[in-house]
Interface confidence: medium
């Protein structure tokens, strides 16, 4: 417990102290006072640096004195031998004897009382930043007029915060400029400007005077900008030296002017303004900026178009333009969207063909469509190949989106039909040297395949069958075969209008118009055994004049049986009309003269004993086209004759191509579109 | 495909606050910025502010400074919104949308009501 | 910020009928105007985007028109599916702001 004062005196004074004694006491006043400690008496071994027997006295670590010996006052008014003065408040004194004293010594007597210290004077630092008052006890700090005492109760500073500025143009200056600014003090001012524009500070080199830096470069007092998470500075020194114009980047700054305790500088002036917010000028190779500026700033908006072939994707859709608008943050709007290039995706695929795996998909890439050659040919012309387009769609060379369409190559046999020998008279043949032969099972009788979903056949074979069974690529029709072949089945049968119903069909003697079209109801895929023939063209060159060799082929009947199970064909010459008109009919069941010729039929046939017969009806009678001798066109279509392995008659195909095409039109399949 | 799911209803009493979250899946958030938009009972749809989750910029309407937060976790693709000081006038469904050009899509929303 | 007014605020129509709603805004938004439909119960969906553009989905018996200021939605035929209400909303620059939406409701 603080006391104010005290005595302290040595272990049995007055008697002699005993050898080998430690003895120490701890004295304290109450804060803000000094002690001063006083001996009236000394009676101590003497030693040198008192190494012996000693009082020490202590003020924390530091020893403030030690004593032995003996002393005697040096003024007859007052009784003190020795004293100590201290601005603290608490002391210890030690008292050491060793093991042995030659004579006898009396130890000591000391005082202590509690004295008022001078704060304001007795300290090398100064406690208070100006005016410093002492009372007993403890001091207080005042501060000059217009100054204010800070929280620390000791240091004075200028009251020069909180004032904030949100006019778009202003001047700030430090305190009393331009006299000296005041010592020890922290300035703090606030610029806040509306959203959307930054805070530009302009410094004149000439209005700066501030206490230079130390040795170390460390500014004794500050001028710092902060903006957000941007400094500007600490800048001192005479002159301003950082940048005459301070763009912050942002609406709010914060200026804060920071002083130590002297110097005579006059300190600063500077002026802002608020700039919009300027944000960057993006130059991009994909898209166009409008208008176009040198500089964009808040509130500027931009319509950004994607350049021919690039697009902005979003969700499930892609737009080639949007606009943009400068934010109050520096920042444009919508800055996610980004012209990419136009993705075509993954090219569709084509029946009867096939399509490249493009390297990639997007904008410009190339892909190629082939078709199934040599089955197969591209309609169009074109050699196939696509790139992708500026919107998004794969086209061709033509720019346009539609699909190749890969169609059958018609006329052409794998093998050509080398029969030398002499249906009846003719040879084996095999189905690759005839892959349009279509085999009817009921009633027993041909046809010629003439496009993936249509077969022509003779009117007279389908007219007692609406559903017809078919067969291709195949040329044997033993049972066992037609079971590995193709079987074709009928959606609808179309017999030609101008085909007269009978009702007997046996007794028949007009075959004028004997043409049908069977519509399949699923399309035929070619091969080696299986393509189409092709229709005669319009011109004249498709007109067949007597001699012009046609093949046909067939299961029909031959000299040696009803039936054929293996394919038979024969070379057969067009003979004039009246040939056919000579031969004697052979049918009890009809009146020979009453037969008709028209100009719907051809005669061929007479040479060799080759010829068409029953089982053979609906076949092709195939002729080289004039304009490409590789390919085959349906020049005939086997019909009817007056007696076998004479001359035949065969429906005049060129006579029905418009009525075979419209057809064929009108019926179309949608999936074939 | 994309998909957002927002966390369940919350009650709160008025003056607490109340944090809603939206998990994005089927794309990355950082490509996109993530908004917040309310609708009280009967009443319109309000934007209340986007953050773009690449930087973590948020920006706010001014009926809802000082008392919103937007924030975004980009490691599990999620995005935040925060509402402060709850007075029964913030009784709304709070949907989640994201947007580059247009809000493609939404949250099924969820319905925050405050009440003492 | 911008004012986004629609009208009518609700309307009553009938099946197979053709719907216009119209939008204001109280200042140019060139074109970054978007239409939203939303079912009770349901988050909003989007029809149209900048202005004029059907998002992918949407049949075509929407249709949005206009630039600067003024703006339609039109339904060329009403289906029963599409009563329901719509909202418009600027996005040229922020706060995005609303309509107050067209209620539209069977007749």
């Known amino acids: 417990e603080p006391t104010m004062y005290g005595e302290i005196l040595s272990p049995n004074y007055p008697q002699a102290y005993p050898s080998e004694v430690e003895k120490s006491w701890d004295i304290e006043v109450p804060e803000g006072y000094g002690i001063h400690l006083y001996f009236t008496h000394l009676d101590i071994e003497l030693s040198e640096n008192c190494a012996y027997d000693s009082v020490q006295i202590m003020s924390g670590d530091i020893e403030e004195g030690r004593l032995c010996g003996q002393r005697t006052s040096n003024n007859p008014h007052s009784p003190i031998v020795e004293e100590f003065q201290v601005p603290y408040n608490k002391l210890q004194v030690i008292f050491k004897s060793d093991f042995s004293n030659e004579e006898r010594f009396t130890g000591f007597a000391a005082y202590y009382v509690a004295t008022d210290i001078n704060e304001c004077t007795d300290f090398v630092d100064a406690p208070c930043s100006h005016f410093c008052n002492n009372f007993i006890g403890g001091y207080f700090c005042s501060c000059p007029p217009e100054y204010f005492l800070h929280d620390d109760m000791k240091n004075c500073g200028v009251n020069c915060s909180g004032d904030v500025f949100t006019a778009l143009i202003g001047e700030i200056a430090s305190p009393n400029y331009p006299k000296p600014y005041p010592e020890n003090s922290r300035c703090e001012y606030q610029i806040r400007l509306e959203k959307g524009f930054q805070v530009v500070v302009t410094v004149r080199r000439e209005d700066f005077d501030v206490e230079p830096a130390d040795s170390e470069g460390n500014c004794l007092d500050s001028l710092v900008f902060v903006a957000g998470d941007q400094q500007f500075g600490p800048y001192c020194g005479r002159g301003f030296p950082g940048p005459l114009n301070i763009e912050t980047k942002s609406n709010a700054l914060d200026i804060i002017f920071q002083t130590d305790l002297t110097g005579q500088n006059k300190g600063w002036k500077l002026r802002y303004h608020g700039d919009p917010m300027p944000c960057p000028k993006e130059e991009t190779p994909t898209s166009v900026w409008e208008p176009a500026k040198a500089k964009y700033v808040f509130r500027d908006v931009v319509r950004i178009t994607c350049l021919d072939g690039f697009e902005v994707v979003e969700g499930r859709v892609g737009a080639t333009s949007f606009h943009s608008t400068c934010q109050s943050n520096g920042k444009w709007s919508n800055s996610k969207l980004k012209c990419q290039p136009v993705d075509c995706g993954i090219p569709e695929s084509i029946e009867n063909g096939k399509v490249e795996d493009p390297e990639s998909t997007l904008f410009g890439s190339v892909t190629r469509y082939t078709c199934e050659e040599p089955y197969y040919y591209m309609e169009n012309g074109g050699n196939g190949q696509y790139h992708c387009a500026s919107n998004g769609s794969w086209v061709n060379e033509a720019l346009s989106p539609e699909l190749p369409k890969c169609v059958p190559v018609c006329g052409v046999p794998r093998e050509p039909f080398e029969g030398k020998q002499r249906i009846i008279g003719g040879s084996d043949a095999d189905i690759k040297n005839f892959p349009w032969q279509v085999f009817f099972d009921n009633p027993w009788a041909g046809g010629a395949l003439i496009d993936e979903y249509w077969v022509l056949t003779a009117a007279h074979v389908v007219e007692g069958n609406q559903e017809p069974t078919m067969y291709v690529g195949s040329t044997s029709v033993q049972t066992s075969r037609l079971a590995k072949s193709k079987m074709l089945t009928s959606e609808r049968v179309f017999i030609h209008p101008g085909w007269k119903l009978l009702e007997v069909p046996e007794a028949r003697t007009n075959f004028d118009n004997d043409i049908a079209l069977v519509q399949l109801k699923d399309p035929v895929k070619m091969g080696p055994t299986v393509a189409p023939i092709c229709l005669p063209g319009t011109s004249s060159d498709y007109n067949l004049m007597d001699g012009d060799l046609g093949l046909i082929a067939g299961w029909g009947r031959t000299e040696k049986r009803d039936r054929a199970l293996r394919l038979k064909a024969a070379r057969l010459p067009v003979a004039p009309l009246r040939k056919c008109r000579e031969v004697k009919v052979e049918n009890p069941k009809a009146d020979a003269g009453a037969y008709v010729f028209t100009p719907n039929m051809i005669c061929a046939g007479g040479e060799k004993g080759m010829d068409s017969c029953k089982g053979d009806s609906g076949g092709a009678f195939a002729v080289q086209d004039p304009n490409d001798k590789a390919k085959f066109y349906v020049a005939g279509l086997v019909s009817w004759g007056p007696q076998c392995g004479t001359y035949g008659l065969y429906t005049r195909v060129q006579n029905y191509v418009d009525w075979i095409k419209k057809t064929m039109q009108e019926n179309s399949t949608p999936s074939k579109d | 495909q994309v998909q957002l799911v927002q966390s369940g209803a919350e009650v709160k009493k008025p003056g607490a606050s109340v944090k809603v979250s939206c998990k994005a899946s089927?794309?990355?958030?950082?490509?996109?910025?993530m908004h917040w938009v309310r609708q009280a009972p009967e009443q319109g749809l309000e934007w209340m502010g986007w953050?773009?989750?690449?930087?973590?910029?948020?920006i706010y309407a001014q009926k809802f400074q000082g008392r919103v937060t937007i924030t975004a976790d980009t490691s599990t693709n999620t995005a935040y919104m925060e509402l402060s000081s709850l007075r029964s006038e913030d009784t709304a469904v709070y949907y989640c949308?994201?947007?580059?050009?247009?809000?493609?899509?939404w949250g099924q929303g969820t319905l925050v009501t405050v009440s003492s | 910020d911008i004012q986004m007014t629609q009208s009518p605020k609700s309307l009553s129509a009938s099946v197979g009928d053709r719907v216009t709603i119209t939008c204001r805004a109280s200042?140019?938004?060139?074109?970054?105007l978007d239409w939203y439909q939303q079912k009770p119960g349901q988050s909003p969906k989007l029809l149209i985007y900048?202005?004029?553009y059907r998002y992918s989905g949407v049949p075509s018996r929407f249709s949005g028109s206009g630039s600067g200021t003024d703006f339609t939605l039109t339904i060329s035929s009403l289906q029963p599916e599409d009563f329901a209400t719509y909202y418009c909303?600027?996005?040229?620059?922020?706060?995005?702001?609303f309509g107050q939406g067209t209620k539209l409701e069977i007749k």
């Open positions: 089927g794309f990355n958030i950082k490509e996109y910025y």
């Open positions: 953050i773009d989750p690449e930087n973590a910029d948020a």
């Open positions: 909303q600027q996005q040229y620059t922020t706060p995005y702001t």
């Open positions: 949308a994201r947007s580059r050009l247009f809000f493609a899509y």
């Open positions: 200042q140019d938004v060139r074109t970054a």
């Open positions: 900048s202005a004029s």
